[in-house]
Interface confidence: medium
Amino acid sequence: QSGPLPKPSLQALPSSLVPLEKPVTLRCQGPPGVDLYRLEKLSSSRYQDQAVLFIPAMKRSLAGRYRCSYQNGSLWSLPSDQLELVATGVFAKPSLSAQPGPAVSSGGDVTLQCQTRYGFDQFALYKEGDPAPYKNPERWYRASFPIITVTAAHSGTYRCYSFSSRDPYLWSAPSDPLELVVTGT
């Protein structure tokens, strides 16, 4: 038995983390020859029957989960994976530090700590060049990110964000960058 029409992909360009007032493009990509696309913001009545949504200036109200599907003839595809569009710069930046320090020997351990003056209960850590956060979202309730048995691959520039689980798509500005240096490799 063949399945239903395969699901399209939905991506945010240049990134799904969008500073307030900056532009972003959401693009739904299905197979060639699609008759109709449906791109929508979940938990709202906002949708459009086009594959591309250009947002010239990111707003708080546009943050949230998006999904798209397409129609060929009378058949609708399975929906795309949900895309979480996050507005950043809504709150003041946290500070990011490394314990015991930003220079660590290969094979050693280091903990990156994201700290904020506000009562945020969620934290996300990003390494420059990696589109995904350093930790699975289900672990974001912790402000500490231990890195056990450091390797050269951990070298790089890190930033963290803080936000509240009550408004999970409204994030702080990124912390100042922290350069992690791995020695003895």
Epitope: G3, P4, K7, E40, L42, S43, S45, Y47, S69, W76, L78, P79, D81, Q82, A132, N136, P137, E138
Partner: antibody, heavy 114, light 106 residues
Framework: QVQLQESGPGLVAPSQSLSITCTVS????????VNWVRQPPSRGLEWLGM???????DYQSTLKSRLSISKDNSKSQVFLKMNSLTTDDTARYYC????????WGQGTSVTVSS | DIQMTQSPSSLSASVGGRVTITCKAS??????IAWYQHKPGKGPSLLIH???TLQPGVPSRFSGSGSGRDYSFSISNLQPEDIATYYC????????FGGGTKLEIK
């Protein structure tokens, strides 16, 4: 050919934790999500949670505090862990592919009893 | 969370007849509803998704319609092999099943 197969312990003591594995074939876990659904005896279907292709998770709100879903893409396996079991958790547990769950396993029966 | 109220909980009909099951969502689900057939000892089978799109291989005597909060599912020309429990599922925001409808043949 798309297939999903659940494997579980069968019998679990109250207050203990439950671990079930869903082994899939015919599709990639890096692209498709997997849901967990259960059916208590003589009751309807209940959605428990889902792990997406990118590893993010969604849980039913009433179970979120004692439920964890994870996966190993390289082994094509998805894992359900539920803590603090009671007799109300006695059910047949199913894994099913993505939204809106177009392929299902046969289910594995779990009894919570001392 | 979105609640799905499915009715009736059981029904009986004759071979060759027509039955209709309804599901009402607690809020607008924007057509993100699927319908499943569940037989004892098996995993459920997807019949319809996105309100009315039939899964390949599913007979055209199964159909679905609706919008907003109100949706329906029908089987025409009822066959003995249709004996099963049927469920609706909303997947607009997380996932919620209806309570199920047990179909029997007179």
């Amino acid at each position: 050919q798309v297939q999903l197969q659940e494997s579980g312990p069968g019998l679990v003591a109250p207050s203990q934790s439950l671990s079930i594995t869903c082994t899939v074939s015919g599709f990639s876990l890096t692209y498709y999500g997997v849901n967990w659904v259960r059916q208590p005896p003589s009751r309807g279907l209940e959605w428990l949670g889902m792990i997406w292709g990118d590893g993010s998770t969604d849980y039913q709100s009433t179970l979120k505090s004692r439920l964890s879903i994870s996966k190993d893409n390289s082994k094509s396996q998805v894992f359900l862990k539920m803590n603090s079991l009671t007799t109300d958790d006695t059910a047949r547990y199913y894994c099913a592919r993505d939204l809106p769950m177009d392929y299902w396993g046969q289910g594995t029966s779990v009894t919570v009893s001392s | 969370d979105i609640q799905m109220t499915q009715s009736p909980s059981s029904l009986s009909a004759s071979v060759g007849g027509r039955v209709t099951i309804t599901c009402k969502a607690s809020q607008d689900i924007n057509k993100y509803i699927a319908w499943y057939q569940h037989k004892p000892g098996k995993g459920p089978s997807l019949l319809i998704h996105y309100t009315s799109t039939l899964q390949p291989g599913v007979p055209s005597r199964f159909s679905g319609s609706g919008s907003g909060r109100d949706y329906s599912f029908s089987i025409s020309n009822l066959q003995p092999e249709d004996i099963a429990t049927y469920y609706c599922l909303q997947y607009a925001l997380l996932l919620t099943f209806g309570g199920g409808t047990k179909l029997e043949i007179k």
